[in-house]
Interface confidence: low
């Protein structure tokens, strides 16, 4: 089933309106903001989630990038245009006709322009680096235990196939999770790494998108893993196109 039958809710997305109006009285859910039907058996796309959240306050993040082509989401929240499948449209424009190109996770990858700006294709983000700093603990976590726990989390909570968790690096207090997913690797039904990363980001911030599953309680061998800082870097299959002015 696509949504919880007993009280007609969407387990994977609380930013929905649900009603038992499907075939045979089946519970069906639509995303707030867009009204698009969502599959409650999997993660909702980041685009539809951002659309539902468009009135939330802006949150900007900046830190040194790990490579010249990595992107950080410094623009924060915006009301995106999503395609009929719920993916980001390659070109996004605001109400003042300022436009820019985004990647598959909705992060700007070009300078801002006007309505004449062309974004020929939605460029896929194939590598996501999630950089975490955990709060001080009595000692360092065991690397292999940490690795196993984070892989389990992405598999069980976010339904991301284990093959897409490329590596877990640990140098106390910094944890780095690498997600990799090329266009050719992603099969129908596979959770997108961008969506998994977004759900994880919201969980870490205590803003869980799951309905009635409680917040994220991360433990490694029973020891709570409390994150005090998160930064996410996005690498695209085609490098971004910014002017030199922005890079200085």
């Amino acid at each position: 089933h696509t949504a919880a039958q007993d009280n007609c809710t969407c387990p994977t997305n609380k930013m929905t309106v649900c009603s038992p109006d499907g075939p045979g009285g089946r519970c069906q859910c639509r995303a707030l903001g867009s009204g698009m039907a969502v599959d409650c058996s999997t993660l909702t796309s980041k685009c539809l989630l951002l659309k539902a959240r468009m009135s939330a306050p802006k949150n900007a993040r900046t830190l040194v990038r790990p490579s010249e082509h990595a992107l950080v989401d410094n623009d924060g929240l915006y009301d995106p245009d999503c395609d009929p499948e719920g993916r980001f449209k390659a070109r996004q424009c605001n109400q003042t006709s300022v436009c820019w190109c985004v990647n598959s996770v909705g992060v700007r990858r070009t300078d801002k322009g006007d309505l004449s700006l062309r974004c020929d294709e939605l460029v896929r983000t194939h590598h996501i680096l999630i950089d975490l700093r955990h709060r001080p603990t009595a000692g360092a976590f065991n690397h292999s235990d940490l690795d196993a726990e984070l892989r389990r989390l992405f598999r069980e909570r976010y339904r991301l196939h284990p093959k897409f968790v490329a590596a877990v690096h640990y140098e106390q207090p910094t944890i780095q999770i690498e997600l990799r997913q090329n266009t050719s690797q992603k099969a129908a039904g596979d959770v997108d790494i961008g969506d998994a990363a977004y759900y994880f980001e919201r969980d870490i911030k205590g803003e869980s998108l799951f309905q009635g599953r409680g917040g994220l309680d991360l433990r490694v061998r029973g020891e709570p893993l409390q994150v005090e800082r998160t930064l996410i870097y996005y690498l695209d299959e085609i490098p971004p196109k910014f002017s030199m002015k922005r890079l200085t």
Partner: antibody, heavy 121, light 107 residues
Framework: QVQLVQSGAEVKKPGASVKVSCKAS????????MQWVRQAPGQGLEWMGW????????KYAEDFKGRVTISADTSTSTAYLQLSSLKSEDTAVYYC??????????????WGQGTLVTVSS | DIQMTQSPSSLSASVGDRVTITCKAS??????VAWYQQKPGKAPKLLIY???HRYTGVPSRFSGSGSGTDFTLTISSLQPEDFAVYYC?????????FGQGTKLEIK
């Protein structure tokens, strides 16, 4: 490839009803809405209504309310348009067309071939 | 209801010409306008959606622009297969409404 195949032409008498079918293939039926548009001979396009195939909820244009019923059978990926109390002015080609579910996506990217409905005594 | 007014209603042009068709909405529809091409006896075909997004497989000579109430479809260099009727449609709010059509004929 994505296709919408409609039922054949119909000739009806005034006061009768007609039911036009539209079978979808090449995509997951419930991921897109189904719209109905008609075109009288030599005239422009007129929107009649649509159905959210995921929820099964239809929405009708005011001019057709009470006379039109749009439905969908997800098991056969088929949408239906039923128009009752037919008048000669209802003579037109009736098209089904695919759209997204949300308001940003109510443009029609795939169309059926059209079904000519002739109302004549 | 939102009225969509197209101009001109008919237009004669030659192969190679640059042609512009305009569509005016009776109220603000953001960028939610689509353009279709229809040939006799055939279903319409989507050319442009969301005012300026060219649909898959549509030749680059077709472009759309505009926001708010004023929209334009431009064919940069007319080809023989472009002679047809063109419709604009607002996909901002129901009831969805179309322009009355522009018939593009060979001069």
């Amino acid at each position: 490839q994505v296709q919408l195949v409609q039922s054949g032409a119909e000739v009806k008498k005034p006061g009768a009803s007609v039911k036009v079918s539209c079978k979808a293939s090449g995509y997951t039926f419930t991921t897109a809405g189904m719209q109905w548009v008609r075109q009288a001979p030599g005239q422009g396009l007129e929107w009649m209504g649509w159905i959210n195939t995921h929820s099964g909820v239809p929405k009708y244009a005011e001019d057709f309310k009470g006379r039109v019923t749009i439905s969908a059978d997800t098991s056969t990926s088929t949408a239906y348009l039923q128009l009752s109390s037919l008048k000669s002015e209802d003579t037109a080609v009736y098209y089904c067309a695919r759209s997204g579910h949300g308001s940003s996506y109510w443009y029609f990217d795939v169309w059926g071939q059209g079904t000519l409905v002739t109302v004549s005594s | 209801d939102i009225q969509m007014t197209q101009s001109p209603s008919s237009l004669s042009a030659s192969v190679g010409d640059r042609v512009t068709i305009t569509c005016k909405a009776s109220q603000d529809v953001s960028t939610a306008v689509a353009w279709y091409q229809q040939k006799p006896g055939k279903a319409p075909k989507l050319l442009i959606y969301s005012a300026s997004h060219r649909y898959t497989g549509v030749p680059s000579r077709f472009s759309g622009s505009g926001s708010g109430t004023d929209f334009t479809l431009t064919i940069s260099s007319l080809q023989p297969e472009d002679f047809a009727v063109y419709y604009c449609q607002q996909h901002y709010i129901t009831p969805l409404t179309f322009g009355q059509g522009t018939k593009l004929e060979i001069k």
